[in-house]
């Protein structure tokens, strides 16, 4: 049905007929996400009329249909202004049961209505800065948080929980004030950690799940994203013991997430959100990643369970295959692995054994090849300085921040970026001493050591002197040509 | 005949192994000597790399060393404001307030009479008034059309602090200083069994013999380029833009017979300034044929290719390109905050409509 016909029907005021028209419009446009310019004015008129009715109140038996129309039109940028008003946002919030209002809603809310209005709010908040501002002013986050806290006591359908969390994600991603509010005033980390535990269906002592079902995966990912939003600019501060305990507990849940697979090939995405959040944990809380008890079949190294570190390494391997969005794909996992390696000798030694095993092939440049080491060394000259730094820093820490060792494994040419940035191009040892880790040389390396060019990091035959056979005068003449060039450049 | 060795044979084998080992050790000593040549145009960030070594390494400059830079800071500050005032004449920019013309005349008088390492309250006042003038600011905003120190705004904005009688330059102040290096500065450093000799070449034709020993057996050249130079307009006495000048030299050095097998470490410096500039000044100023977008990623990658493509021996000669931001010692601390914004943006991008 055309939007003009629906608007005309609306103006008559015959409720059932209008609902029928809306139902027909909804069926036709349920999958429309782009709209025809020709009917833009008609859609705007329809949106205005709908808003007017929305603000006056919708009949219970027609609400879902009307809200579906509003949801469809809220995908259309040209209709956003109509919907993004204080009154219509309040009306939608009331139907979603998240409005902070004086009068409580008497009867238990209709879940279908609640769900539709949540979807409308998600669309509006995602697309309209005005709606974002109004939603923040209306303090929707307060009732949303309250409801998330009720998931243990009351059963809400998966979809309602998902859209609650999605709306929380959008509000915290787009509004720093909401972020702060959820983090501080509403104790968001505790609230969402609890929600995550409930969603994963585990107590921290249990062995990790094998496969997290699809719906739980969806909800867990939303929780992880919200937690990321509210912790990334907050945990840089020193945390007290009480907070540290909470973050450690969250860490144990994230450990489960790293070890679990997600249904429906969403494992990498799920792990990605997990790793992003791990990067926000206070550094002193990362020790939980190494605190898993050893059990049958676990990977043991120096008496420590390395299952989680190994899983993170496997995740890094997978991520290094991508070329798209490289920075956000690899920086978080590299930063988590770097900090684990920096603080825990067993983790550092394990990672070094995996990533920088004793050198055997000294005939190939460190950046050439398909080993993890080669891929990481290639990133050390990446255009994006953030990518370059995380990759170089990781390898540097695996070398116990020893410049000679770093040069040995990566070559001075590749290492120069990090060394320059750290003021280490001329050697020296930074603060952050390491309990001295020994570095074993293979027989192959010892044999070839004399022929290795430290700049390229591989064996190179001594090249013939290009000036062989030249007289001193000729050499001087060539030298002066260069000097003149340098002189011109340095002026 | 069997495979058993007589006692003499065994001794001979041992001797042979020993000789091999000694030869290897001698060879190692020579091979583990790394000769680096540090090159780059003025303001390319070359000297900053050397200063940076000092700041983060060895706990930075001592107070005494910092004090010695006071005169350089003052000189840089005065030279910067003078360069702007001179350019106003050339670019036909008037002072916002006509009274500043007197200050400008006063500036030249006071600057000429200034004692090295001192800045009088009178001189500081003159500079401050001039720097605040809207015409001076307009001229500063066109600094790509004349030669101006990168650190001009840094010092001039901080004049109140710098002009204090008890002023001692900070590490960051020292890092921003600009001194014309001349001749060759040789630095030696050792990484375990690797002996490095770095020659910082500043031009100026010093004694010829000295040069030859610089150029023989160079393991790698560290070549510095200021990315932010791409939009600088030629001074009257220049034939080509400074970026093209750098490329020309890079071409000559990269393909020079002295450096046939010499790897090159290419530092594309001042990426922070470049990132800011590229939003306003298109790359086509320097490369008219450039058809990409004016985003940092695309433009920087293009410049990298322009340099790397000059290498005529791609199979035997390595170029290691590093994008750096030499004056920011803070970006040395390991932080991945830059990524968090991107993560949130992408998580939002992945949110569809319902």
């Amino acid at each position: 049905m055309e939007p003009r016909a629906v608007a005309d029907a609306l103006e008559t005021g015959e409720e059932d007929a209008v609902t029928e028209a809306l139902r027909s419009f909804n069926r036709e446009h349920s999958q429309s996400f782009t709209f025809d310019d020709a009917q833009q004015e008609d859609r705007k008129r329809l949106a205005k009329l709908l808003v007017s009715v929305l603000e006056q109140g919708l009949s219970p038996k027609h609400r879902v249909t009307w809200l579906q129309t509003i949801r469809i039109l809220s995908r259309d940028r040209s209709c956003l202004d109509s919907f993004a008003s204080r009154q219509s946002l309040h009306a939608l919030a009331c139907y979603a049961d998240i409005a902070i209002s004086e009068e409580p809603i008497p009867q238990p809310p209709d879940m279908d209505v609640l769900l539709e209005s949540l979807k409308c709010l998600c669309n509006l908040v995602l697309s309209s800065p005005t709606a974002q501002m109004l939603a923040a002013e209306a303090r929707l986050v307060v009732r949303l948080a309250e409801r998330v806290g009720l998931y243990r006591k009351r059963s809400y359908p998966h979809e309602v929980q998902f859209f609650d969390l999605r709306l929380l994600f959008l509000l915290t991603a787009l509004r720093t004030d909401v972020r702060q509010q959820l983090f501080q005033e509403l104790h968001g980390v505790r609230l969402l950690t609890d929600a995550l535990e409930l969603t994963l269906g585990v107590a921290p002592k249990e062995n990790p799940l094998v496969i997290l079902p699809a719906q739980e995966t969806e909800r867990a990912m939303e929780i992880l994203k919200v937690l990321f939003n509210i912790t990334y600019d907050s945990v840089k501060r020193e945390v007290d013991e009480e907070d540290a305990a909470l973050y450690r507990y969250l860490g144990t849940l994230l450990r489960h997430c790293v070890m679990a697979d997600a249904a429906g090939d969403r494992t990498e995405e799920f792990h990605g959100h997990t790793v992003n959040l791990l990067g926000n944990l206070p550094l002193k809380c990362l020790d939980v990643l190494l605190a898993l008890e050893l059990h049958e079949g676990s990977l043991e190294f120096m008496g420590v369970n390395m299952d989680v570190i190994n899983a993170l390494l496997a995740f890094l391997e997978k991520r290094l295959h991508q070329t798209h969005r490289l920075k956000e794909c690899v920086a978080p996992v590299l930063s988590v692995l770097t900090e684990c390696a920096r603080m825990h000798r067993p983790a550092r030694k394990f990672l070094k054994a995996q990533v920088l095993p004793p050198l055997r092939d000294v005939r190939t440049r460190p950046e050439v090849g398909d080993l993890l080491r080669n891929k990481l060394v290639r990133l050390m000259t990446h255009l994006d300085t953030d990518v370059k730094r995380v990759a170089a820093e990781f390898l540097f820490v695996l070398c116990s921040e020893s410049v000679p060792r770093f040069i040995k494994y990566t070559g001075y040419g590749n290492a120069a970026g990090l060394l320059a940035a750290r003021g280490l191009m001329a050697g020296g040892r930074p603060e952050g001493q390491y309990s001295e880790d020994e570095d074993t040389d293979t027989e192959e390396y010892r044999e070839a050591k004399a022929s290795i060019n430290p700049v390229t990091g591989r064996v190179e035959e001594k090249p013939p002197n290009p000036m062989e056979g030249m007289t001193e005068e000729q050499k001087e003449h060539e030298a002066m040509k260069l000097v003149n060039m340098f002189d011109k450049l340095s002026r | 005949m069997g495979c058993t060795l007589s006692a003499e044979d065994k001794a001979a084998v041992e001797r042979s192994k020993m000789i091999d080992r000694n030869l290897r050790e001698d060879g190692e000593k020579a091979a583990r000597e790394v000769k680096l040549l540090l090159l780059g145009a003025g303001e390319s960030g070359k000297s900053t790399i050397v200063k940076q070594m000092k700041i983060i390494h060895e706990a930075g400059y001592s107070e005494e060393e910092c004090k010695q830079y006071k005169a350089v800071v003052y000189s840089n500050t005065i030279q910067s404001i003078i360069a702007i005032i001179r350019a106003m004449g050339r670019l036909k920019i008037d002072f916002g307030d006509a009274a500043r013309a007197d200050d400008a005349r006063q500036l030249f008088v006071l600057a000429g009479a200034a004692e090295e390492g001192f800045m009088t309250a009178e001189l500081a006042g003159v500079i401050k008034r001039l720097w605040k003038d809207s015409g001076v600011q307009a001229c500063f905003n066109r600094s790509r059309e004349y030669q101006l120190n990168d650190s001009a705004a840094y010092y001039l904005n901080d004049l109140d602090r710098i002009a204090q009688p008890n002023y001692i330059p900070t590490q960051q102040d020292v890092l921003r200083t600009r001194v014309k290096t001349t001749g060759i500065v040789e630095t030696h450093f050792t990484f375990k069994d690797l002996h490095f000799k770095m020659f910082d070449v500043g031009g100026q034709r010093s004694e010829r013999k000295k040069w030859i020993h610089c150029f023989e057996g160079v393991t790698a050249i560290i070549f510095c380029v200021a990315l932010s130079d791409y939009d600088l307009v030629l001074a009257e006495d220049e034939e080509m833009n400074r970026m093209h000048e750098s490329m020309k030299l890079f071409d000559s050095i990269c393909n020079n017979k002295w450096f046939t097998d010499t790897s090159i470490i290419l530092f594309l410096n001042k990426k922070d300034l470049f990132e800011e500039k590229i939003k306003k000044s298109p790359l086509t100023i320097c490369y008219p044929e450039y058809a990409g977008s004016n985003t940092y990623e695309e433009a920087a990658a293009y410049i990298q290719c322009q340099f790397e493509d000059l290498n005529k021996r791609k199979d035997t000669k390595e170029i290691y390109t590093h994008f750096t931001c030499a004056t920011d010692t803070k970006n040395v601390q390991f932080v991945f905050d830059a990524v968090t914004d991107v993560i949130i943006k992408n998580n939002l991008k992945d949110c569809g409509l319902f």
Partner: nanobody
Framework: QVQLVESGGGLVQPGGSLRLSCAAS????????MNWARQAPGKGLEWVST????????SYADSVKGRFTISRDNAKNTLYLQMNSLKPEDTAVYYC????????????RGQGTQVTVSS
């Protein structure tokens, strides 16, 4: 043809009450949303209240909230407006109308009934 006839207006003192009625004919009353609007001397038409077809959803202008109550009796094809705590600023001609919107179509609004609040 659609007919809407308002009644119940009059002169009342501030703080007093009145009950307006609107008799509908010429259409299936029970299917339509109905509204009350008013027009004060020299002013435009102002929406007062709306009620849905089943009578279970009502809404009011902020100026009358808590004092006026809209209701309907579908068996009698009649719309009501109970007005309490009347104020002088409630003085106006009150119209009943069909639908959610203050239509300018003649058949959707009655002739109106005068309400005067004065001491």
């Amino acid at each position: 043809q659609v007919q809407l006839v308002e009644s119940g207006g009059g002169l009342v003192q501030p703080g007093g009450s009145l009950r307006l009625s609107c008799a509908a004919s010429g259409f299936t009353f029970s299917r339509f949303v109905m509204n009350w609007a008013r027009q004060a001397p020299g002013k435009g038409l102002e929406w007062v209240s709306t009620i849905n077809s089943d009578g279970d959803v009502t809404s009011y202008a902020d100026s009358v909230k808590g004092r006026f109550t809209i209701s309907r009796d579908n068996a009698k094809n009649t719309l009501y407006l109970q007005m309490n705590s009347l104020k002088p600023e409630d003085t106006a001609v009150y119209y009943c109308g069909k639908g959610w919107f203050l239509n300018r179509r003649d058949e959707s609004r009655g002739q109106g009934t005068q309400v005067t609040v004065s001491s």
